[in-house]
């Protein structure tokens, strides 16, 4: 129904008026990943607290088994941050050696799932090379944007390295999606 | 009042109708920061331009002492840009004197405050090691993400450092929200 | 006319009502980049794919040579990644010469042009040194924020090195923006 | 009101060293860098380094390297800065300031004048 | 080392003149660059930083402007305590470093 069909004419309403808070959106916050079984040559996905602290599911949205699940078609922003930790990255290793250096690199992934297709769509990646010289460093790697999702769609993060993950604070380490 | 009170009861609307340009917004830059007195262990909070050249604040979002004052509960999504310059971090230093090797780092923090609340809610943050070994460097931090907030919460930024903030240009530090 | 002549009067509603699905929306992605004549003294701005893959505008906002048009004054939320990609920044090669070192750096602004103005408007910017020790490095910038523009306004990104754009995913560079 | 308060002027020989001290008050004295500037007497102004109070790292311009110490004692809120084999073109006026690592400097000592005569 | 130059080393002028006072740095710095006021036997005190922002209780006569290499700082009009020594300072990189100073004088 046009939403002109109850307002005046010349208000510029070209689809169905639709209250904010209705929306399907979510925050989910970081929590300590478990060795799992992930397939070979795709990185591995974060699970998520999606209830306790700062994170929420509302109006639909729903997550389940390491994916948001879209419950309505339209354009969503979709963001994410990943803190990395690690130690001494291999790149001072091999440069100590003198070998030819293939930097060590972090990398985070939001992907999307559409049952109806067999590859999974890479939405956003941020990827970053690691050489630092001091023995310990972290950072966050943050993605941000806007997607035309189909309802039924799964979004996930994958990571390139699930052990270098910060999962020790929700304010971290987070994912989460809102429809426009 | 649900607007299907109001509307064609197929439209899916379970909120009062609103319209977007009445919702509350701000976005705030860079000022010089001067040495002031801060709380002992816990990061200093940046202050903030609310008017001038790039920055506002509408529909009752008010800025005062630091703070951003959300006038109404609701979804809203918050974001943050630090960029910080520095020279020759300790990192360096450490290492030339070969002592074990704990880096510089850089931290911004999105902090909510809540007067019913004895202790402030982080809500995002970035911190990075910082171990460049160049003499001069410099780096932005950026934050975003939703979060749900009340009337009369208070939004504001600490960094780990408030000396190394670039306050130069307006584009390179800055602090907003908007209702969702 | 203020929504409240057609909804109930307690509902807080100061200006049209509006239905999202209606609003100037886009994403591009990165494409490879041909060499262009570009101002000097000015970053030269990327080119942009706006229908294949994941990109889009919609409702009258459109692209053409690298600019984004704005066909609606209000508030934008503008945001931008671009991934960059180098081999042994200068910057070590100066350390290692024992010069006073000035690092290389790989900076992204979002710029606004009104046809009205003389000079264009820097929005946003991300600015990082770059000095790595490794052969290889890369890195994104991210940027993000929200903007009052005009009708007819015109955004772009501008980089510090167009030769350094990773131009190999969508995913990894891109531009959007879309009116709240 | 921001203040820094400098130790009394000194009179060192040749060989010697000198041990200046600033006192801050009126912010967080952790939050800013220390930087150390002299003045030799009739001439201008030269930077010689700051220190963080907050970790007490250290930022020596080459000329001083090995001369110089910079350290702090965040418990008084006091920053030192120590030359050593003092020479007569040591005489100067030696001054702290604080402000950021790469910044002006908005509040200075009242300075302290170190003489090197043998 | 980035070098600061200043000129003139002297000028003379009178109460109610305007003065100009140059500084160029030996290489970009951006905006990185603040102009110090400094009287016989005191500190010096912060005028201008970033290039053109003025300090908050220093009087608006005083004005700063450029960018790069090529810096200024202006008295529009001169008052009686504006004769010091002014300094320039660049704070792009390290080492920091001043210029070699500005006395205006009473003519």
């Known amino acids: 129904l046009k939403g002109q069909e109850f307002a005046p004419s010349h208000q510029q309403v070209y689809a169905p008026l639709r209250a904010d808070g209705d929306k399907p959106r979510a925050h989910l916050t970081v929590v300590r990943q478990t060795p799992t079984q992930h397939f070979k040559n795709q990185f591995p996905a974060l699970h998520w607290e999606h209830e306790l602290g700062l994170a929420f599911t509302k109006n639909r949205m729903n997550y389940t088994n390491k994916f948001l699940l879209i419950p309505e078609s339209g354009d969503y922003f979709i963001y994410s941050q990943v803190t990395f930790r690690g130690m001494t990255s291999e790149c001072s290793e091999i440069r100590r050696a003198g070998r030819p250096n293939k930097p060590d690199s972090i990398t985070v992934v939001i992907t999307k799932v559409t049952d109806s297709y067999p590859e999974p769509t890479q939405l956003l990646m941020g990827t970053k090379s690691v050489c630092e010289v001091g023995s310990n460093w972290f950072q966050p790697i943050y993605l941000g944007a806007m997607f035309s999702l189909q309802e039924g769609d799964k979004l996930m993060v994958n990571v390139s390295d699930i052990s270098l993950v910060d999962y020790t604070k929700e304010d971290k380490t987070f994912f989460g999606a809102f429809l426009l | 009042l649900k607007g299907q009170e109001f509307a064609p009861s197929h439209q899916q609307v379970y909120a009062p109708l609103r319209a977007d340009g009445d919702k509350p917004r701000a976005h705030l830059t860079v000022v010089r920061q001067t040495p002031t007195q801060h709380f002992k262990n816990q990061f200093p909070a940046l202050h903030w331009e609310h008017e001038l050249g790039l920055a506002f604040t509408k529909n009752r979002m008010n800025y005062t002492n630091k703070f951003l004052l959300i006038p109404e509960s609701g979804d809203y999504f918050i974001y943050s840009q630090v960029t910080f310059r520095g020279m020759t971090s300790e990192c360096s230093e450490i290492r030339r004197a070969g002592r074990p090797n704990k880096p510089d780092s850089i931290t911004v923090v999105i902090t909510k405050v809540t007067d019913s609340y004895p202790e402030p809610t982080q809500l995002l943050m970035g911190t990075k090691s910082v171990c460049e070994v160049g003499s001069n460097w410099f780096q932005p931090i950026y934050l975003g993400a939703m979060f749900s907030l009340q009337e009369g919460d208070k939004l504001m930024v600490n960094v780990s450092d408030i000396s190394l903030v670039d306050y130069t240009k307006e584009d390179k530090t800055f602090f907003g929200a908007f209702l969702l | 006319l203020k929504g409240q002549e057609f909804a109930p009067s307690h509902q807080q509603v100061y200006a049209p009502l509006r239905a999202d699905g209606d609003k100037p929306r886009a994403h591009l992605t990165v494409v490879r980049q041909t060499p262009t004549q570009h101002f000097k003294n000015q970053f030269p701005a990327l080119h942009w794919e706006h229908e294949l893959g994941l990109a889009f505008t919609k409702n009258r906002m459109n692209y053409t040579n690298k600019f984004l048009l704005i066909p609606e004054s209000g508030d934008y939320f503008i945001y931008s990644q671009v991934t960059f990609r180098g081999m042994t920044s200068e910057c070590s090669e100066i350390r290692r010469a024992g010069r006073p070192n000035k690092p290389d750096s790989i900076t992204v602004v979002i710029t606004k042009v009104t046809d009205s103005y003389p000079e264009p408007t820097q929005l946003l910017m991300g600015t990082k040194s770059v000095c790595e020790v490794g052969s290889n490095w890369f890195q994104p910038i991210y940027l993000g924020a929200m903007f009052s523009l005009q009708e007819g306004d015109k955004l772009m990104v501008n980089v510090s090195d167009i030769s350094l754009v990773d131009y190999t995913k969508e995913d990894k560079t891109f531009f959007g923006a879309f009116l709240l | 009101q921001v203040q820094l308060v400098q130790s009394g002027a000194e009179v060192k020989k040749p060989g010697a060293s000198v041990k200046v001290s600033c006192k801050a008050s009126g912010y967080t004295f952790t939050g800013y860098y220390m930087h150390w500037v002299r003045q030799a007497p009739g001439q201008g102004l030269e930077w010689m380094g700051w220190?963080?109070?907050?970790?007490?790292?250290?930022n020596y311009v080459q000329k001083f390297q090995g001369r110089v110490t910079m350290t702090r004692d965040t418990s008084i809120n006091t920053a030192y800065m120590e030359l050593n084999n003092l020479k007569s073109d040591d005489t100067a006026v030696y001054y702290c300031?604080?402000?950021?690592?790469?910044?002006?400097?908005?509040?200075w000592g009242q300075g302290t004048m170190v003489t090197v005569s043998s | 080392d980035i070098q600061m130059t200043q000129s003139p080393s002297s000028v003379s002028a009178s109460v109610g003149g305007r003065v100009t006072i140059t500084c160029r740095a030996s290489?970009?710095?951006?905006?990185?660059l603040a102009w110090y006021q400094q009287k016989p036997g005191k500190a010096p005190n912060l005028l201008i930083y970033a290039a053109s922002s003025l300090q908050s209780g220093v009087p608006s006569r005083f004005s700063g402007s450029g960018s790069g290499t090529d810096f200024t700082l202006t008295i529009s009009s001169l008052q009686p305590e504006d004769f010091a020594t002014y300094y320039c300072?660049?704070?792009?990189?390290?080492?920091?470093?001043f210029g070699g100073g500005t006395k205006v004088e009473i003519k």
């Open positions: 290489q970009d710095i951006s905006i990185w």
């Open positions: 220190i963080k109070p907050k970790s007490g790292g250290t």
């Open positions: 300031a604080t402000g950021g690592s790469q910044d002006a400097s908005d509040f």
């Open positions: 300072q660049q704070a792009d990189s390290f080492p920091l470093t």
